[in-house]
């Protein structure tokens, strides 16, 4: 799996999970989130060569097509596979609200 | 929806469905498929700017992060959303086989 256990341990040009810490205030200009101040969002990036973690039959076909026709602009892309939620605390007026934001943290990647 | 009805009708630099016909023999070097000779596989390509068909909360966060921090290399990618199968005819010896290959045709795209 193209997850932290594999990707953060290996130097990898191909599609892999990349570390990304987002500070809500500094990076997004959000002041309304009280806790946490930021989080490990991570992201997916890297090349998708032939059979590198292909997600579907179509992405397999596309990576083969791209290998045989290197001038082609049609190639699979490295995107998130497994995501996890993030729980945040914010206030509406003086009332604290706890919200679970779905699909906020990328845990693994795929070529799609 | 970033499907043929929208994307093939509009000139679109952003993430959209692109037409791609794949000839099995010429483009993939496959001689074993008897019918069809090729098919409209299509593919997804284009930029994923702020709020353009964002698939998850993470891709929304990433597109905002990328907008506010344009020097960042972390940005969402244009990939397939809905896929359809393709039915093929091939032979094992002289025995005809009909097979439905899943997820072979891209029908719409998303920024993920």
């Amino acid at each position: 799996a193209l997850d932290a256990a594999y990707c953060f341990r290996n130097v990898q040009d191909n599609c892999c999970l990349r570390p990304l810490y987002i500070d809500f205030k500094r990076d997004l200009g959000w002041k309304w989130i009280h806790e946490p101040k930021g989080y490990n969002a991570n992201f997916c990036a890297g090349a998708c060569p032939y059979l590198w973690s292909s997600d579907t039959q179509h992405s397999r076909v596309l990576s083969l097509y791209n290998t045989i026709n290197p001038e082609a602009s049609a190639s699979p892309c490295c995107v998130s596979q497994d995501l996890e939620p993030l729980t945040i605390l914010y206030y509406i007026g003086k009332t604290p609200k706890i919200e679970q934001l779905s699909n906020m943290i990328v845990k693994s990647c795929k070529c799609s | 929806a970033l499907d043929a009805a929208y994307c093939f009708r509009n000139v679109q630099d952003n993430c959209c469905l692109r037409p791609l016909y794949i000839d099995f023999k010429r483009d993939l070097g496959w001689k074993w498929i008897h019918e069809p000779k090729g098919y409209n596989a299509n593919f997804c390509a284009g930029a994923c700017p702020y709020l353009w068909s964002s698939d998850t909360q993470h891709s929304r966060v990433l597109s905002l992060y990328n907008t506010i921090n344009p020097e960042a290399s972390a940005s969402p990618c244009c990939v397939s959303q809905d896929l359809e199968p393709l039915t093929i005819l091939y032979y094992i010896g002289k025995t005809p086989k009909i097979e439905q290959l899943s997820n072979m045709i891209v029908k719409s795209c998303k920024c993920s």
Partner: nanobody, 116 residues
Framework: QVQLVESGGGLVQPGGSLRLSCAAS????????MGWFRQAPGKQRELVAI???????NYADSVKGRFTISRETAKSTMYLQMNSLKSEDTGVYYC??????????WGQGTQVTVAS
């Protein structure tokens, strides 16, 4: 009921100025990232400028130095001051409100035409 109402569009000569407003109702305005988008005839909708809930701003390269985005929380209103207008600025300008906790909202648009 959420409403975003744009105003301030119109016909202006090249080099002229306009100030667009987007009045929001039915939302907790201070939590929303607000953006101006535009769509020229036969072209895709594109981001012109954004101001986050905390006041961070960003502009499309084509409008940097000419347009200024701002927000007034007390009035639940966002503005776009457009100076040195060019013919390529012509299009329908849409207001967008986005907060990750809910969905995002769009206004109906206001027409800006730059012509002599």
């Amino acid at each position: 009921q959420v409403q975003l109402v744009e105003s301030g569009g119109g016909l202006v000569q090249p080099g002229g100025s306009l100030r667009l407003s987007c009045a929001a109702s039915g939302i907790s305005f201070s939590y929303y990232d607000m953006g101006w988008f535009r769509q020229a005839p036969g072209k895709q909708r594109e981001l012109v400028a954004i101001v986050t809930s905390g006041g961070r701003t960003n502009y499309a390269d084509s409008v940097k130095g000419r347009f200024t985005i701002s927000r007034e929380t007390a009035k639940s209103t966002m503005y776009l001051q457009m100076n040195s207008l060019k013919s390529e600025d012509t299009g329908v300008y849409y207001c967008n409100a986005h907060w990750i906790v809910t969905t995002d909202y769009w206004g109906q648009g206001t027409q800006v035409t730059v012509a002599s």
